[in-house]
């Protein structure tokens, strides 16, 4: 019965693919993965971002964005407990909310950046549930009906799971990019050594490479105080 319910849920999700708002349900204390599919050709060369909607008509406050170098967008970038990684070839932006808390519930956006402009890839409504034992299985997930205010919403089938420490879900295309990056560094290192030998310099003083494939510098954004109607 369980697999059948999940299949039905998956089917409904796929039918709803064109809708504006997707609901992702997560469990407090666990990790939630949000995926935002996009046209990889249309958004070629563009960095991506994850932002939180401040009120119904307010601005979208940037939480985290992909690597400054678009080629390195597959590297996971953190801000606090939120991570972002972009499979630029496959056209999937993935956001991980680690140690989900009640206050993480709200409206978010996946964005594609170009200059000072930002295109919305997907509007995401994050729901936080208290405890997996407190809630019915996937077949009983909430589906917006006629009376729902978010009539364009649908429930995403990927419910949160606990990520193991150090687990990095690399998409296959990102591995290709990583290999290409390593290959490029090797070529740069080899050519630097060759240049050093050619000029009679000591090897080991190769020019610094801007391509850093193993390390994600990341950055800490200042958290804005909660906007309330109080």
């Amino acid at each position: 019965m369980e697999p059948l319910r999940l299949l039905i849920l998956l089917f409904v999700t796929e039918l709803s693919g064109a809708h504006n708002t997707t609901v992702f349900q997560g469990v407090a204390g666990q990790s939630l993965q949000v995926s935002c599919p996009y046209d990889s050709m249309k958004h070629w060369g563009r960095r991506k971002a994850w932002c939180r909607q401040l009120g119904e008509k307010g601005p979208c406050q940037r939480v985290v964005s992909t690597h400054n170098l678009w080629l390195l967008s597959f590297l996971r970038r953190w801000n606090g407990s939120t991570a972002i990684t972009d499979d630029t070839l496959g056209g999937t932006l993935t956001i991980t909310l680690r140690n989900l808390q009640p206050h993480d519930a709200g409206l978010y956006q996946c964005q594609s950046l170009h200059g000072s402009e930002a295109d919305t890839l997907r509007k995401v409504l994050v729901e936080v549930l208290a405890d997996p034992l407190d809630h019915r299985d996937a077949g009983d997930l909430w589906f917006p009906g006629e009376s729902e205010s978010f009539e364009d919403a649908h429930v995403e089938h990927s419910i949160s799971r606990s990520l193991l420490e150090g687990e990095i879900p690399f998409p296959p295309t990102s591995i290709l990019l990583l290999l290409a990056c390593i290959f490029l560094i090797k070529i740069l290192a080899a050519s630097a050594l060759w240049a050093a030998a050619w000029h009679g310099q000591k090897p080991g003083t190769h020019p610094p490479s801007e391509l850093d494939c193993g390390h994600d510098p990341g950055y800490q954004l200042q958290t804005l105080p909660g906007l309330r109607d109080t």
Epitope: A28, Q101, A105, V128
Partner: antibody, heavy 123, light 107 residues
């Protein structure tokens, strides 16, 4: 101005159920969490659970798990709290309260309160 | 669940005096702490949210401070209408929990 109006006082027999309503007016109903808090005579405040109407899924305090059901009807902007298997110690004033959150859907700061509904459980 | 301990249980003061109420959490609640005032026969009233932000319409004599596990509500100069029971409440983790309350009574 947001107002929460609760249903009237109830007298119930042990083992029975009670359903208290909370009608909201003067503000957006859907995206604000509605919590239910109870207060036994001469005692402190106790959070029972809450719901965000747009999500439709309630979260409950473990103590009330299995006995309480919180629902919301967006068409009438009304939240409901049903408590079953009543016992004498459930005699209390039951309040509904709305979150002050704007984009923080579960802000937890309870800005608006209903007038309270006294539920008396007596044989 | 997170346990909130309020002290003192009762505070006997005169109008015009300064009141300092304490709330201690069994584990960090960051700044997700609110303070409420309740008078007999009335529903609680939100005074402070996010540890230090005054709610709309709350007089400036009420102020909140603290983060993590230790929080304080201060009433700089007590007015006759301030004599009531005060509760702290955390919303860092479910279930939301309240402190046992501090009764501020006239000396």
């Amino acid at each position: 101005q947001v107002q929460l109006v609760q249903s009237g006082a109830e007298v119930k027999k042990p083992g029975s159920s009670v359903k208290v309503s909370c009608k909201a007016s003067g503000g957006t109903f859907s995206s604000y969490a509605i919590s239910w808090v109870r207060q036994a005579p001469g005692q402190g405040l106790e959070w029972m659970g809450g719901i965000i109407p747009i999500f439709g899924t309630a979260n409950y305090a473990q103590k009330f798990q299995g006995r309480v059901t919180i629902t919301a009807d967006e068409s009438t902007s009304t939240a409901y709290m049903e408590l079953s298997s009543l016992r004498s110690e459930d005699t209390a004033v039951y309040y509904c309260a709305r979150d002050s959150g704007n984009y923080d859907y579960w802000s937890g700061a309870l800005r608006y309160w209903g007038q309270g509904t006294l539920v008396t459980v007596s044989s | 669940e997170i346990v909130l301990t309020q002290s003192p249980a009762t505070l006997s003061l005169s109008p015009g005096e300064r009141a300092t109420l304490s709330c201690r959490a069994s584990q960090s609640v960051s700044s997700y702490l609110a303070w409420y005032q309740q008078k007999p026969g009335q529903a609680p009233r939100l005074l402070i949210y996010d540890a230090s932000n005054r709610a709309t319409g709350i007089p400036a004599r009420f102020s909140g401070s603290g983060s993590g596990t230790d929080f304080t509500l201060t009433i700089s100069s007590l007015e006759p209408e301030d004599f009531a029971v005060y509760y702290c409440q955390q919303s860092s983790n479910w279930p939301w929990t309240f402190g046992g309350g501090t009764k501020v009574e006239i000396k």
